[in-house]
């Protein structure tokens, strides 16, 4: 099994992931590990020799890089906020603030806007990555109600008056609860004639 | 060389506020970010937050948030950790520090008194 | 948040003692921990980071090791100057934690 450098006819190297094709002497190289680059170059009697990024700079992979990539911080003015440090292994980790959604996407997201209003009687779809998409409003299923415009408010189920031990006054809808009322308050007057019957 | 040099002791009444500064100096004050680390009589390290004084940008620990705001002048190359509604559980070593996988430079702490 | 567990709280050790204390993180958190040195009145200081890397200036008898969840530091043979109190963090992810701490006593 041969060790980097060694000759290789066919342009290509048995690890492609830590290894590298050298075409000027024809050579499979070391690549460098995450968090370091390359000081000096393989030879055919000599293997790449890597050093340690220095602080504030990293490289994510295996690499035959000259240099390490400078971290930056995420852009708040594009919505994003910080969620992990730049190490020299990795670049920031960064995702949209709460109540933004990812609008433009380049290989990581680089600018959120605000989540849309879902209006009462709605809710927003769960959905399985945070700051992934916009807001789908769904409608709060039965038994439940939601009665605020907001992009975060989720549908509460009514208020079920019997466990407090009182009665129901007027029933829950989507958007609004249920009313109870005390069951020895008298009924309105409207409703006062069903009674002595 | 890295220094991190701090502001004096303070005496605060529960309620008030207090503001601590760090004056940064032998590196690019814009391009490292500085945290603030506090530290309980006998207890363990608790991690406050940071700015990026490039874009004077803070983010904090949602343990503070609300109380405690972190600034930066550039102009002075100094950061300023600024607490508020103190209360006795507040009395603690407010450290600054520059980070780097981890933090290899501190400043030498601020030790703040809370009674009233 | 990453809960971060040292053991043990604190610990009796003579000069010459090889000493190792363990950290054990909630949640995975690679190899982003790092190990300070902490004497009274004093700030901590910076030994490992990377879990493994031994700060520059930090004597050889110092060392780290692990990844994902349970790190450890040790110390080869224990020196005066190394009585004092060790703490572990991550720098993974917002909020940085750190572990409670280990007192490190003179027997």
């Known amino acids: 099994q041969a060790v980097p450098p060694y000759a290789s006819e066919n342009q290509t190297c048995r690890d492609q992931e830590k290894e590298y094709y050298e075409p000027q002497h024809r050579i499979c190289c070391s690549r460098c590990p995450p968090g370091t680059y390359v000081s000096a170059k393989c030879s055919r009697i000599r293997d790449t020799v890597c050093a340690t990024c220095a602080e504030n700079s990293y490289n994510e992979h295996w690499n035959y890089l000259t240099i390490c990539q400078l971290c930056r911080p995420c852009d708040p003015v594009m919505g994003l906020e910080e969620i992990a440090p730049c190490t020299s292994k990795r670049k920031t980790q960064c995702r949209c603030q709460p109540g933004m959604f990812c609008a433009a996407w380049a290989l990581e997201c680089t600018h959120c806007e605000l989540l849309s209003d879902c209006p009462p009687g709605t809710e927003a779809e769960l959905k399985d990555e945070v700051g992934k998409g916009n807001n789908h409003c769904v409608p709060c299923k039965a038994g439940h109600f939601q009665n605020t415009s907001s992009p975060s408010a989720r549908c509460q189920p009514h208020t079920r008056c019997e466990n407090q031990g009182l009665v129901e006054a007027a029933p829950g809808t989507a958007q609004s609860d249920t009313t109870c009322k005390n069951p020895l308050e008298p009924l309105p007057p409207e409703m006062s004639g069903t009674m002595l019957m | 060389q890295v220094q991190l040099v701090q502001s004096g002791a303070e005496v605060k009444k529960p309620g008030q506020s207090v503001k601590v500064s760090c004056k940064a100096s032998?590196?690019?004050?814009?391009?490292?970010?500085l945290h603030w680390v506090r530290q309980a009589p006998g207890q363990g390290l608790e991690w406050m937050g940071w700015?990026?004084?490039?874009?004077?940008?803070?983010q904090y620990n949602e343990k503070f948030k609300g109380r405690v705001t972190i600034t930066a002048d550039k102009s002075t190359s100094t950061a300023y950790m600024e607490l508020s509604s103190l209360r006795s559980e507040d009395t603690a070593v407010y450290y600054c520090?520059?980070?780097?996988?981890?933090?290899?430079?501190w400043g030498q702490g601020t030790t703040v008194t809370v009674s009233s | 948040d990453i809960q971060m567990t040292q053991s043990p709280s604190s610990l009796s050790a003579s000069v010459g003692d090889r000493v190792t204390i363990t950290c054990k993180a909630s949640?995975?958190?690679?190899?982003?921990v790092a190990w300070y040195q902490q004497k009274p009145g004093k700030a901590p200081k910076l030994l490992i980071s990377?879990?493994?890397y031994r700060y520059s200036g930090v004597p050889s008898r110092f060392s780290g090791s692990g990844s994902g969840t349970d790190f450890t530091l040790t110390i080869s043979s224990l020196q005066p100057e190394d009585f004092a109190t060790y703490f572990c963090?991550?720098?993974?992810?917002?909020?940085?934690?750190f572990g409670q701490g280990t007192k490190v006593e003179i027997k």
């Open positions: 963090q991550q720098y993974d992810t917002y909020p940085f934690t």
């Open positions: 520090a520059r980070s780097w996988e981890g933090f290899p430079y």
């Open positions: 700015i990026y004084p490039g874009n004077v940008h803070a």
């Open positions: 990377s879990a493994s």
């Open positions: 032998g590196y690019t004050f814009t391009t490292y970010y």
């Open positions: 949640q995975n958190v690679g190899i982003n």
